[in-house]
């Protein structure tokens, strides 16, 4: 089956990094600098992403790979395979169309990115606050204070290494 | 793949809670708060409130406060909203969205959705 | 409370360009994002940050935003487009959606 497909279509056996070649009687011809080929079969070499000015390069095209960019210190990565770079605000900030702006009162953002958000208001899920809120974090809600009873303690677990917002790069 | 999974319709007496659950897969369900918009039949599209997986914190719409309760079990890549004292208003189909990155909070992935009717 | 306004419904021709409107208080100086619903499935962004199309997204998809009026604008409507359209902000505390736009094609 696979040498009577191949018969019918040569380009079958072109493999990733190569093309194949309708000029040069299908021969699967390597495909030229800054283009590339993922898959078998391709008729066209693909030209490589480049990345230029707040992008910067975090893999290098290959013949058979095309380059992955990331952002210049000071930006983060938006949308699918990091499209856009947007500016980095501080912690208790929040990027707007203007720019940085410091989270209003009773707002928080504990990233670099993201919209200031509301502090929890614990009492709604039947708990009290812990730890108050500031610009950069969160209240930290504990139990009602009907579950305390005397002995018990309230532990905060230590934070994961990642918070909401960041993307994996 | 990028999947947020429901649990499946329920039907509810007025006066009872709903508990519908939402299973993240393909991304790490800490990394993105976890939003619940409803839709009443014929209706637009209603945001009820959102949930911090990783801390547990929570923001409910004013309509809703005292009412839900979203919850997450981080270890079952899982959200949870519960809605009490369902009235008939509250029948509709009830939606998980994953908390995009773009600028102003935009909602990149659903859930298929969940339909509780509350009916006597 | 902050409010987004829709038109109801629009209607276009097949290969013609539909506009949607969303009208806010301002609401040049937030960022829309705009989905499309087809019946019995759940939304899908189509637009984020007032003008960026998610992968996968067709081209015809584009959208713009300044002053008090947002728009998403589809060239070249197809009839596989037919679907409620619906924009979206944050505003301080809480999503905000507009009502709701049903694109008839005709």
């Known amino acids: 089956f696979e040498r009577t497909r191949s018969l019918q279509d040569p380009c079958s056996n072109c493999p990733a990094g190569t093309f194949c070649d309708n000029n040069r009687n299908q021969i699967c011809s390597p495909c030229p600098p800054n283009s590339f080929s993922s898959a078998g079969g391709q008729r066209t070499c693909d030209i490589c992403r480049q990345c230029k000015g707040v992008f910067r390069t975090r893999k290098e095209c290959s013949s058979t790979s095309n380059a992955e960019c990331d952002c210049t210190p000071g930006f983060h990565c938006l949308g699918a395979g990091c499209s856009m770079c947007e500016q980095d605000c501080k912690q208790g900030q929040e990027l707007t169309k203007k720019g940085c702006k410091d989270c209003c009162f009773g707002t928080f953002n504990d990233q670099k990115r993201g919209i200031c958000r509301p502090w929890t208001n614990c009492s709604l899920d039947g708990k009290s606050v812990l730890v108050n809120g500031t610009k950069e974090r969160d209240v930290v809600c504990g139990p009602s204070p009907a579950d305390l009873s005397p002995g018990a303690s309230s532990v905060t677990p230590p934070a994961p290494a990642r918070e909401p917002g960041h993307s994996p790069q | 793949q990028m999947q947020l999974v429901q649990s499946g319709a329920e039907v509810k007496k007025p006066g009872a809670s709903v508990k519908v659950s939402c299973k993240a897969s393909?991304?790490?369900?800490?990394?993105?708060?976890m939003h619940w918009v409803r839709q009443a039949p014929g209706q637009g599209l209603e945001w009820m409130g959102w949930?911090?997986?990783?801390?547990?914190?929570?923001n409910y719409a004013q309509k809703f406060q005292g009412r839900v309760t979203i919850t997450r079990d981080t270890s079952a890549s899982t959200a949870y909203m519960e809605l009490s004292s369902l009235r008939s208003e509250d029948t509709a189909v009830y939606y998980c969205?994953?908390?995009?990155?773009?600028?102003?909070?935009?909602?990149?992935?659903w859930g298929q959705g969940t339909l509780v009717t509350v009916s006597s | 409370s902050y409010e987004l306004t829709q038109p109801p419904s629009v209607s276009v021709a097949p290969g013609k360009t539909a506009r949607i409107t969303c009208g806010g208080n301002?609401?040049?100086?937030?960022?829309v994002h705009w989905y499309q619903q087809k019946p019995g499935q759940a939304p899908v962004l189509v637009i984020y940050?007032?003008?960026d199309r998610p992968s996968g997204i067709p081209e015809r998809f584009s959208g713009s935003n300044s002053g008090n009026t947002a728009t998403l604008t589809i060239s070249r409507v197809e009839a596989g487009d037919e679907a409620d359209y619906y924009c979206?902000?944050?505003?301080?505390?809480?999503?905000?959606f507009g009502g709701g736009t049903q694109l008839t094609v005709l």
């Open positions: 969205a994953r908390e995009g990155e773009a600028v102003g909070l935009d909602l990149d992935y």
């Open positions: 393909g991304y790490q369900m800490r990394g993105y708060y």
């Open positions: 949930i911090n997986p990783n801390s547990g914190g929570t």
């Open positions: 301002n609401i040049g100086s937030k960022s």
């Open positions: 940050y007032d003008s």
């Open positions: 979206q902000v944050w505003d301080s505390s809480s999503v905000v």
